[in-house]
Interface confidence: low
């Protein structure tokens, strides 16, 4: 986590040192993409430019001064959402030659006011680039608790740029845009969202057709080219601008590490808390045992006699009892060997009553400090009781 880089995001837009946030966008041949860009202060020219391979300059594709580059005429639109501090550039009828590096920006000089870099990759919908490399599986422990899981249709995060392809894959008549800019029919373009469930659902990752998975999961997955903005794993391109407000703005770059940090802190806190509790329990128990030992010795030994040799080892592992066993712990006293003198009736040293309430089971911490996963805690059937026979 490069925390030291954060201040660079806040350098002035024109700052030469400024590190541009990068977004990867996947588009389908013939489909369309919407590139989401941060909108700085109002009343300034904003634009999307394309980096020229040879010269390294950025040629304007579309800008608010009504300029549209020749090869994008009729298939690019720029819309501003000042209240959300963003502007959107939609490019329709994608072709392979649209693949390349673009940049959003603001200001009169296209090359100077860049605010975000965008890499667009146009491919067949069957074989997007992120699918080529198998994605590392999320470790089991990393799966988010139910509480954190957002519905699959949660709108995308800043890094998840919408890629529009057809909505219903069923036999729905296409909805045509009156606008001349859109010659691709997405069926039907229901507020830019697509519930892509086709005649033949394909099986990419979980399914290549529904939504962008939860935004949170997106935050937690690496933004690598192979995964890039895909949390679009599933190809829904839902972009509900209404629900976006909390996540727009460039401050979003900080949100990711912050959430991750908080998440990890919480985990750490839990682990530490549990460890501390265990230690306390251990020392309490050790003290109690010592006290009991002394009590036993004094009560069982005739004054001058030596300590009995066959005292049951109080530190041996707790006996595991069947689930129904009495919580008070009527343990099995060892049967004395033939001819052995009968010991006095076993003394039941029960821990304080609360310790044996069935709902408060604990493990034999003094035997093993192994950390049980939370899910297992409730299920532990090793009741904690101490049976000290004479």
């Amino acid at each position: 986590m490069d925390f030291w880089l954060w201040p660079l995001y806040f350098l002035p837009v024109s700052g030469a040192l400024r590190i541009l946030p990068e977004v990867k966008v996947e588009g389908e041949l013939g489909g369309s993409v919407t590139i989401k860009c941060p909108l700085p202060e109002m009343h300034v020219r904003i634009y999307l430019c394309r980096e020229m391979a040879g010269s390294g300059t950025c040629g304007t594709v579309v800008s608010t001064t009504n300029f549209i580059k020749a090869e994008y005429k009729g298939r690019v639109t720029l819309k501003q959402y000042p209240r959300k501090n963003l502007f959107l550039v939609e490019v329709t009828q994608l072709t392979e030659s649209d693949s390349g590096v673009y940049a959003c920006g603001a200001g009169m000089n296209t090359d100077r006011g860049k605010t975000q870099k965008v890499t667009l990759n146009v491919h067949s919908e069957y074989e997007p680039s992120w699918e080529e490399q198998p994605m590392p599986e999320t470790p089991k422990w990393f799966h988010l608790p139910y509480l954190f899981q957002m519905p699959a249709y949660a709108s995308s995060s800043k890094f998840v740029t919408r890629v529009t392809t057809p909505a219903q894959r069923g036999k729905v008549p296409p909805v045509h845009h009156s606008s001349p800019t859109t010659q691709i029919t997405h069926r039907p373009r229901v507020s830019r969202a697509s519930s892509v469930a086709g005649d033949k659902p394909r099986t990419f990752l979980p399914s290549t057709t529904a939504s962008k998975i939860s935004a949170l999961e997106g935050l937690l997955k690496p933004q690598t080219p192979s995964y890039n903005h895909h949390t679009r794993l599933h190809r829904q391109r839902a972009l509900d601008y209404g629900s976006q407000s909390g996540r727009e703005g460039q401050g979003f770059h900080i949100l990711i590490p912050t959430i991750l940090g908080l998440f990890l802190l919480a985990l750490l806190g839990l682990v530490v808390k549990r460890a501390v509790e265990r230690r306390k329990a251990l020392s309490r128990r050790a003290r109690r045992l010592a006290v009991r030992m002394r009590a036993l010795e004094s009560s069982q030994r005739p004054r001058g006699s030596p300590r009995p040799r066959s005292q049951n080892n109080i530190y041996s592992a707790c006996p595991r009892r069947a689930r129904g066993a009495d919580a008070a712990g009527t343990g099995e006293a060892p049967v004395p060997g033939p001819g052995a003198p009968l010991p006095p009736a076993p003394l039941q040293v029960s821990e304080s009553p609360w310790l044996h309430a069935p709902s408060l089971k604990t493990s034999c911490e003094y035997v093993s400090l192994y950390h049980q996963p939370a899910a297992m805690m409730e299920d532990s059937d090793s009741d904690d009781y101490i049976n000290v026979p004479a």
Epitope: L29, S97, S124, T165, P174, I184, R187, K200
Partner: antibody
Amino acid sequence: QVQLVQSGAEVKKPGASVKVSCKASGYTLTSYDVNWVRQATGQGLEWMGWMNPNSGNTGYAQKFQGRVTMTRNTSIGTAYMELNSLTSDDTAVYYCARGRSIINHYYGLDVWGHGTTVTVSS
Amino acid sequence: EIVLTQSPATLSLSPGERATLSCRASQSVSSYLAWYQQKPGQAPRLLIYDASNRATGIPARFSGSGSGTDFTLTISSLEPEDFAVYYCQQRSNWPWTFGQGTKVEIK
């Protein structure tokens, strides 16, 4: 063998609609895009649009926007092209042609239907 | 849209001769250009795709070259069955467009 079989010739009145079918045989319809190209008598080839039969995605040339609809029925492996508001200028041979494959290789329009002649006349 | 201009409109040659057909794009189409052959009453047939790749089953006498805006289809030695109309087609930008065709006829 791999082929695209198109429906028979049609004669239509101006203002009417025509729906041409294109059945894939020798391969699965959903494995390749379907393109539609028309050719007026003695003229060149004119690309009308494209459809991904797997998804239903379509892309139409501006000239035909709002007048053409490309659909498919995957269960019978058939693609359709419907053209509305016909005029005499739409009199042509309409071809369906197989395009890009599902593994994203593009081999050009490598398989063509035999063509369907549509005559628009009052 | 990208306009493809083919030249010459008609090419009169004898069997065994070399035919060179040209296709020029109004703007760069990279190498996204294909060539088709069409005989009267038949559907077009793909010869070359992506500027220089021969389609399956196409004889070696057909070759394509070029990139950007200038492309060439060469038939090294004309066979009687090669006399037909040849079209170039770009798939770089939408809409895909075809050239107006070059007719190769027997001299």
